[in-house]
């Protein structure tokens, strides 16, 4: 199709080489198609259009995304050629940064319902470059945590080194929806609730003599509880003795509850004690069996192919540890009578 009639938008993604980050393009179809395809609200010229949320969009029609090769080759279908780019209804999500993402991206309705829709498309010229090392050291992260119940703030990474006074007007989106009521480079949250969690996008305009660009950054915001003050507790095994049958296989499960820690490095090991000897056993990887806001339950099993007389003389020890401290639970095997 002819893309010369597409409306054009220029975006800049200045990514940090120090951290992982994502990027998002919205398909801003021109009126009147946008309400028809992406269910946007019709706002006055002084307002920014609402964007489709990433979730709850099962019943919405799709748009098709293409990338325009710089050498003039035909348009490429994003889904076929770029596995690190995810098409999600009216949004395009880049999972990894890199200058190779620089290029022109075109979106248009998948189903053309009228002749006018043929020209209904948006061309986004995306320039991707690493952030210069000269930029400030304390720039905000693309992953930010808000502590539940307390006051917090969400900073626009590309503007976090500027004071509120010198910052340009910022357009914010949360989960793809416009937050029209906040326009500074930092969103203050007086009391953090779970619903403040989500994907935030901040945009501001940067102009030079030749043209103007929208500088965009994406922030993943997580709502968290305070770090635990407790060492992990072992939920299973509860008993210190376990009845077993000689010659039969045996699996002993160790389950422990670890309180939330922002920097989470749980340790879970099985040891065997035999007289004066003690050694760590090679066992299958630990796995998380339940994860909540406040804690995580992790399980790790020790597997004996068959129980021997020697095993009855041994003590099997589950050892768990977090940054606060460690807990152990010993199990002695006893032959079933």
């Amino acid at each position: 199709f002819n893309i010369s009639g597409c409306s054009t938008k220029k975006l800049l993604w200045a990514y940090s080489t120090r951290s992982e980050e994502e990027f998002i393009l919205f398909c801003d179809l021109p009126e009147p198609q946008k309400s028809h395809f992406c269910h946007r609200s019709q706002l006055s010229p002084t307002q920014v259009p609402d964007h489709l949320p990433f979730t709850d969009s099962k019943d919405l029609p799709d748009v098709q995304w293409y990338r325009q090769p710089s050498n003039g080759d035909p348009l490429e279908d994003i889904r076929k050629s770029y596995p690190h780019i995810i098409q999600d209804k009216c949004t395009l999500r880049f999972l990894t940064p890199g200058v190779n993402n620089t290029g022109s991206y075109i979106c248009r309705p998948k189903m053309i319902k009228s002749p006018y829709d043929v020209a209904c498309c948006v061309k986004m010229i995306l320039e991707v470059k690493p952030q210069s090392n000269a930029s400030c050291e304390n720039s905000a992260s693309h992953k930010q945590d808000l502590l539940l119940g307390s006051t917090g703030s969400i900073s626009c990474p590309s503007l976090s080194c500027q004071s509120d006074a010198q910052s340009p007007e910022v357009t914010w989106y949360k989960n793809g929806k416009l937050l029209s009521m906040t326009r500074s480079n930092r969103i203050v949250v007086d009391e953090v609730y779970i619903y403040h969690q989500g994907t935030y996008v901040c945009d501001y305009t940067q102009s030079d003599t030749a043209s103007s660009w929208t500088v965009r950054a994406v922030v993943q915001v997580r709502t968290i509880v305070g770090d635990t003050k407790l060492k992990p507790d072992i939920l299973d095994p509860v008993e210190s003795t376990l009845e077993v049958e000689l010659g039969k296989p045996l699996t002993i499960s160790c389950k422990a509850r670890f309180g939330f820690e922002r920097v989470f490095n749980p340790v879970m090991k099985w040891y065997i004690k035999d007289a004066d000897l003690e050694w760590e056993v090679s066992v299958p990887e630990a796995k998380s069996i339940k994860s909540t806001l406040k804690d995580e339950i992790i399980e790790r099993n020790i597997i004996l192919e068959k129980v021997t007389q020697r095993d009855l003389r041994r003590t099997f020890v589950c050892f768990v540890q977090n940054s606060i401290g460690n807990t152990t639970q010993s199990v002695q095997l006893k032959e079933k009578r």
Epitope: S35, H39, R40, S41, L43, Q47, D50, P53, T55, D56, S57, D59, L60, W172, K174, N175, K177, L179, S180, M181, T182, R183, S184, I187, V188, V189, D190, E191, V192, Y193, Y195, H196
Partner: antibody
């Protein structure tokens, strides 16, 4: 408890302006957006706009754009709604209503309402 | 703008009746729907938010359901104090819009 107290009834001539106040108490004023909704006699509810008391940012319904101004005074925890170039069809009860969730977020619902201010426009 | 259409515009019912009011949005609004009750001369009162969540202090005989474009408010056993006008409202995008209202009267 959370309360919104609005200013008293007003009678205005066509072409004039009216400024309605809404004083908030019982919660952190800057944490929650404030909506303005009106209701003409015997009619339904009509959303006029919303203000963020923290930054003073506003979003108005297209219908009122250019005629409505919403402001706030954080020192007195009060929001104001001024409607200019009044006409007879602006005769209505005007309500301020607190957004139910701490900003910023999706709009959730208006969980506390003022008692309403009757504005009569008549020549 | 998103249009909200409520039906019926009025209904007559008796105490103890099960009453259902429907609300339809002109486009998908996910679950961004709220229900309000208004009595004559009083300000509206929030009953249900996010289509199905009961606002604190609201009796459990009120319930909401639906997603996308079609929503319902149900009163399982009508009480004398429930005779009022009910409004649905979408909070999916600005301008926020209300339904025309449903007046519940005593039969």
């Amino acid at each position: 408890q959370v309360q919104l107290v609005q200013s008293g009834a007003e009678v205005k001539k066509p072409g004039a302006s009216v400024k309605v106040s809404c004083k908030a108490s019982g919660y952190t004023f800057t944490s929650y957006y404030m909506h303005w909704v009106r209701q003409a006699p015997g009619q339904g509810l009509e959303w006029m706009g919303i203000i963020n008391p923290r930054g003073g940012y506003t979003t108005y319904a297209q219908k009122f754009q250019g005629r409505v101004t919403m402001t706030r005074d954080t020192s007195t925890s009060t929001v104001y709604m001024e409607l200019s170039s009044l006409r007879s069809e602006d005769t209505a009860v005007y309500y301020c209503a607190k957004e139910g969730r701490v900003s910023p977020t999706d709009y959730y619902g208006m969980d506390v309402w003022g008692q309403g201010t009757t504005v009569t426009v008549s020549s | 703008d998103i249009q909200m259409t409520q039906s019926p515009s009025s209904l007559s019912a008796s105490v103890g009746d099960r009453v259902t009011i429907t609300c339809r949005a002109s486009q998908s609004i996910s679950s961004y729907l709220n229900w309000y009750q208004q009595k004559p001369g009083k300000a509206p009162k929030l009953l249900i938010y996010d289509a199905s969540s009961l606002q604190s202090g609201v009796p459990s005989r009120f319930s909401g359901s639906g997603s996308g474009t079609d929503f319902t408010l149900t009163m399982s056993s009508l009480q004398p104090e429930d005779f009022a006008t009910y409004y649905c409202q979408q909070s999916y995008s600005t301008p926020l819009t209300f339904g025309g209202g449903t007046k519940v009267e005593i039969k």
